[in-house]
Interface confidence: medium
């Protein structure tokens, strides 16, 4: 979690002198409670916005907006603490709006916004706005929270952001899978325009229950420049268990911009439906999936006795 490296952050508006400060997420009013505290924010809204850095990079940001309740407690409102919690890591980042002048009633409802928290594709956040000073112990809460799910890199607008492009969002491998004789599966996909290695993972499951019964991983060496955008083939020797027939194939690139953390593409091959009259054919009706980024850098199991290695198709 971080703030967009922008010009000076601004929270002042007509009738209010305000400054944005870094916060430890532990306002002084927690430790030294005040007798009179403001009411909670109203109509907290979180939206996905996109902002450019000074270097010209485009990032997704959380646009946080809220209004004040129209009661006398605004006379005791000294500012607000904005907190963003990334749910999968418990990482929290806070900023503080510090009012340098006292709020007055005016004809329009007071409205505040902040658009400088950079968020990650596919992550979920809890956004909280605390009015300051915070309430006395056992006092009514004066904060409002909302969860906010950031779309992943498959989303059209997200695809062109710097973090998604760095993860390979513009690469479409167009994975195809076909079953061959002798317990084999051929995976074919389009290489990207970078001399980078790839890894293809096959995981197999039983049809009746989602029970892992086999997995294999194969490395593809970095293609030469003349092989960019060509098709690469990998042939897997499948598990010998005839019922181990539901296959999940994942292609993981190792682009220089994302290394072990690049977006993975996947297809699922269901178990064949075998009737008395039909012979199993090459699988054409695979289900494409887009795999989220994995924080893991482990590349693991292979049980591929006798399986052939990849070659590029021209």
């Amino acid at each position: 979690l971080r703030l967009l490296d922008h010009r000076a952050l601004v929270c002042s508006q007509p009738g209010l002198n305000c400054t944005v400060k870094n916060s430890t997420c532990l306002d002084d009013s927690w430790i030294h409670p005040r007798n009179l505290t403001p009411s909670s924010p109203k109509d907290l809204q979180i939206q996905l916005h996109f902002a450019h850095t000074q270097q010209g990079d485009l990032f997704p940001v959380a646009h946080i907006e809220w209004t004040l309740q129209t009661d006398a407690s605004i006379l005791y409102l000294e500012g607000a603490e904005l907190s963003v919690l990334q749910l999968n890591t418990n990482e929290r980042l806070c900023v503080k709006f510090q009012f340098l002048s006292m709020l007055q009633h005016h004809r329009k409802r007071w409205r505040f916004s902040f658009s400088h928290f950079v968020v990650d594709p596919g992550q979920e956040y809890e956004v909280t706005v605390h009015h300051l000073p915070k309430p006395i112990p056992d006092g009514d809460p004066n904060h409002q929270s909302k969860n906010f799910l950031v779309p992943d890199c498959e989303h059209a607008r997200m695809k062109v952001t710097t973090p998604c492009m760095s993860s390979g969002s513009l690469w479409d491998p167009n994975i195809t899978v076909e079953t061959l004789e002798a317990h084999q599966l051929r995976v074919s996909f389009t290489l990207w325009n970078e001399s980078t290695p790839y890894q293809v993972l096959l995981e197999s499951f039983s049809d009746s229950e989602n029970h892992s019964c086999f997995d294999v991983v194969k490395q593809i060496f970095a293609p030469r420049q003349e092989e960019f955008h060509q098709r690469a083939n990998v042939t897997f020797t499948l598990s010998k268990f005839h019922w181990c027939c539901h296959h999940h194939v994942q292609v993981q690139p190792f682009f220089s911009s994302c290394l072990n953390d690049c977006l993975r593409h996947a297809v699922t091959v269901p178990c064949p439906v075998i009737s008395n009259t039909t012979v199993p054919k090459p699988v054409a009706d695979y289900i494409p999936l887009w795999e989220p980024r994995s924080g893991s850098s482990d590349y693991k199991d292979d049980d591929d006795k006798g399986s052939s290695h990849h070659h590029h198709h021209h």
Epitope: S212, D215, K240, W243, D303
Partner: antibody
Framework: QVQLVQSGAEVKKPGASVKVSCKAS????????ISWVRQAPGQGLEWMGW????????NYAQKLQGRVTMTTDTSTSTAYMELRSLRSDDTAVYYC?????????WGQGTLVTVSS | EIVMTQSPATLSVSPGERATLSCRAS??????LAWFQQKPGQAPRPLIY???TRATGVPARFSGSGSGTDFTLTISSLQSEDFAVYYC?????????FGGGTKVEIK
């Protein structure tokens, strides 16, 4: 050359747990699954389960379900097998082996004795 | 589970003679069968997989045959180092199962 080196012999009391390690060398650890097989004194071989070092998926023998846990640490190329609530009939030599269906390399074995 | 039955339990053979070991599955395992050799105090050593393919470094005197439910391991001319216990193992279905073993001893 491929080697699987297991931890030393253990003596445990009934009800206790044991954790046997299996350190792999001579190949890329992360390309092959690890299976565990045990052999009671004077008896035959019994398959205990398999762990995929790719996904962490495991497949345990039904009779050990709930008592056995298999894990790997890819940073040290080591597989672990933990067996809980030990009974006297768990006294055996425990082997790790490479691959998930047939086993092409075996560890030297770890004797686990369960005795009060 | 698939039950693997080996026979005989003990086979007495003279060095230089032929030894034939049998393994029967309670249901078809196709050719998904392996054979292992084990000597006292040692880990099993792979001999054969896929019913008839010799593992790396295994002498040509060891051969495997069969498919479905009936399998045979043949040692064409027994050497002194071949006296051991031999196990078959199926890998056609979970749980993987072993036969009870055949002990080949010197006659």
């Amino acid at each position: 050359q491929v080697q699987l080196v297991q931890s030393g012999a253990e003596v445990k009391k009934p009800g206790a747990s044991v954790k046997v390690s299996c350190k792999a060398s001579g190949y890329t650890f992360t390309r092959y699954g690890i299976s565990w097989v045990r052999q009671a004194p004077g008896q035959g071989l019994e398959w205990m389960g398999w762990i995929s070092t790719y996904s962490g998926n495991t497949n345990y023998a039904q009779k050990l379900q709930g008592r056995v846990t298999m894990t790997t640490d890819t940073s040290t190329s080591t597989a672990y097998m933990e067996l809980r609530s030990l009974r006297s009939d768990d006294t055996a030599v425990y082997y790790c082996a490479r691959r998930q269906l047939y086993f092409d390399y075996w560890g030297q074995g770890t004797l686990v004795t369960v005795s009060s | 589970e698939i039950v693997m039955t080996q026979s005989p339990a003990t086979l007495s053979v003279s060095p230089g003679e032929r030894a034939t070991l049998s393994c029967r599955a309670s249901q078809s395992v196709s050719s998904n069968l392996a054979w292992f050799q084990q000597k006292p105090g040692q880990a099993p050593r792979p001999l054969i997989y896929d019913a008839s393919t010799r593992a790396t470094g295994v002498p040509a005197r060891f051969s495997g045959s069969g498919s479905g439910t009936d399998f045979t391991l043949t040692i064409s001319s027994l050497q002194s180092e071949d006296f051991a216990v031999y196990y078959c193992q199926q890998y056609d279905n979970w749980p993987l199962t072993f036969g009870g073993g055949t002990k080949v001893e010197i006659k």
